[in-house]
């Protein structure tokens, strides 16, 4: 049985994909199905993720590479790897305790996830309000009441989009 | 679906040579050491030699060594057996095999005979 | 090289029979040991790895035990299409081995 053998660290010629046994001489050996091992010159083998309920494998473990997940439509990812799952919210709402709820007067949410933010001030820049915020679209601000003088042109925007069917908020 | 399928068997008379290939789908080769393992009519399953996944790292049966070179070729997503001075005893179907030995390909027979 | 030895070498049993089968290894595996099902003309079938874990879409009546040196594979109740070539194989070091065979036919 032919091998190569290092002058320095054996393990060091253990692949990825294998592991190094201590007491054995450190002889290589396979990880075993639904392990694996990234790097070279490991003592073990690691045990592959399983992406199981809420979970869908998004890349299939290999010998030398762990499994990644994700989440099954209606839930999105938080934490490193993604390492949890949280339910979608539609926009205009945030997730609390109880479930998703509306944001409240003043904030916005234009995503699935995440919590309701409050409108941008204005003023606070000196501008004014172009168009009104809602639960899912922050306030446009526009230039401020100053910079509307007699002879300056005016600018007229665009009336936000609305869904067919749905009334005016 | 994993599928691992060798080919590029035959009859070859001692003293020749064959290349084996095997052509592996449903999953990332590249990622996957391998392994080619044997088996001669009517005998139990003999291990041949290894691949690492990039294929650094090689291993070799005694009762091949120096007459078999195993490679790989990832971008072709394909595993190779170069077989030389062929014997008698050589006569198999020879198998090839993720690292994991969970999926294995249907073989292809090699005959050494005169 | 670990040199694993199995027995019985025939098995002769009815269907709804229980099955076991033994592998023993020259020297201590630790739990790298793996079960196989090869039926004629087919590749051999991954059903147990790591002595005791049954692979992916193996039905429950298979099960592994053992550790070091001594393991067995239990079949609970014997169905038809269990009938086949068992091989214990060991990767707990290269180079990799396997045992010669237990083959389970109908009584």
């Known amino acids: 049985f032919e091998r190569t053998r290092s002058l320095q660290d054996p393990c060091s010629n253990c692949p990825a994909g294998t592991f190094c046994d201590n007491n054995r001489n450190q002889i290589c050996s396979p990880c075993p199905p639904n392990s694996f091992s990234s790097a070279g010159g490991q003592r073990t083998c690691d045990i592959c993720r399983q992406c199981k309920g809420v979970f869908r494998t998004r890349k299939e473990c290999s010998s030398t590479s762990n499994a990644e997940c994700d989440c099954t439509p209606g839930f999105h990812c938080l934490g490193a790897g993604c390492s949890m799952c949280e339910q979608d919210c539609k926009q205009g709402q945030e997730l609390t305790k109880k479930g998703c709820k509306d944001c409240c007067f003043g904030t916005f949410n234009d995503q699935k996830r995440g919590i309701c933010r409050p409108w941008t001030n204005c003023s606070l820049d000196g501008k004014s309000v172009l168009v009104n915020g809602t639960k899912e679209r922050d306030v446009v601000c526009g230039p401020s009441p100053a910079d509307l003088s007699p002879g300056a042109s005016s600018v007229t925007p665009p009336a936000p989009a609305r869904e067919p069917g749905h009334s005016p908020q | 679906e994993v599928q691992l399928v060798e080919s590029g068997g035959g009859l070859v008379q001692p003293g020749g040579s064959l290349r084996l290939s095997c052509a592996a789908s449903?999953?990332?080769?590249?990622?996957?050491?391998m392994h080619w393992v044997r088996q001669a009519p009517g005998k139990g399953l003999e291990w041949v030699s290894y691949?690492?996944?990039?294929?650094?790292?090689?291993y070799y049966a005694d009762s091949v060594k120096g007459r078999f070179t195993i490679s790989r070729d990832n971008a072709k997503n394909s595993l190779y057996l170069q077989m030389n001075s062929l014997r008698a005893e050589d006569t198999a179907v020879y198998y090839c095999?993720?690292?994991?030995?969970?999926?294995w390909g249907q073989g292809t027979l090699v005959t050494v005979s005169s | 090289e670990i040199v694993l030895t199995q027995s019985p070498a025939t098995l002769s049993l009815s269907p709804g029979e229980r099955a076991t089968l033994s592998c023993k290894a020259s020297?201590?595996?630790?739990?790298?040991v793996s079960w196989y099902q090869q039926k004629p003309g087919q590749a051999p079938r991954l059903l147990i790895y790591?002595?005791?874990n049954r692979y992916t879409g193996i039905p429950a009546r298979f099960s592994g035990s053992g550790s070091g040196t001594d393991f067995t594979l239990t079949i609970s109740s014997l169905e038809p299409e269990d009938f086949a070539v068992y091989y214990c194989?060991?990767?707990?070091?290269?180079?990799?081995?396997f045992g010669g065979g237990t083959k389970v036919e109908i009584k």
């Open positions: 095999a993720r690292d994991w030995v969970d999926y």
């Open positions: 449903g999953f990332t080769f590249s990622e996957f050491g």
């Open positions: 691949i690492s996944s990039g294929g650094s790292t090689i």
């Open positions: 020297e201590n595996v630790g739990s790298y």
């Open positions: 790591g002595a005791s």
């Open positions: 194989g060991q990767s707990y070091s290269y180079p990799l081995t």
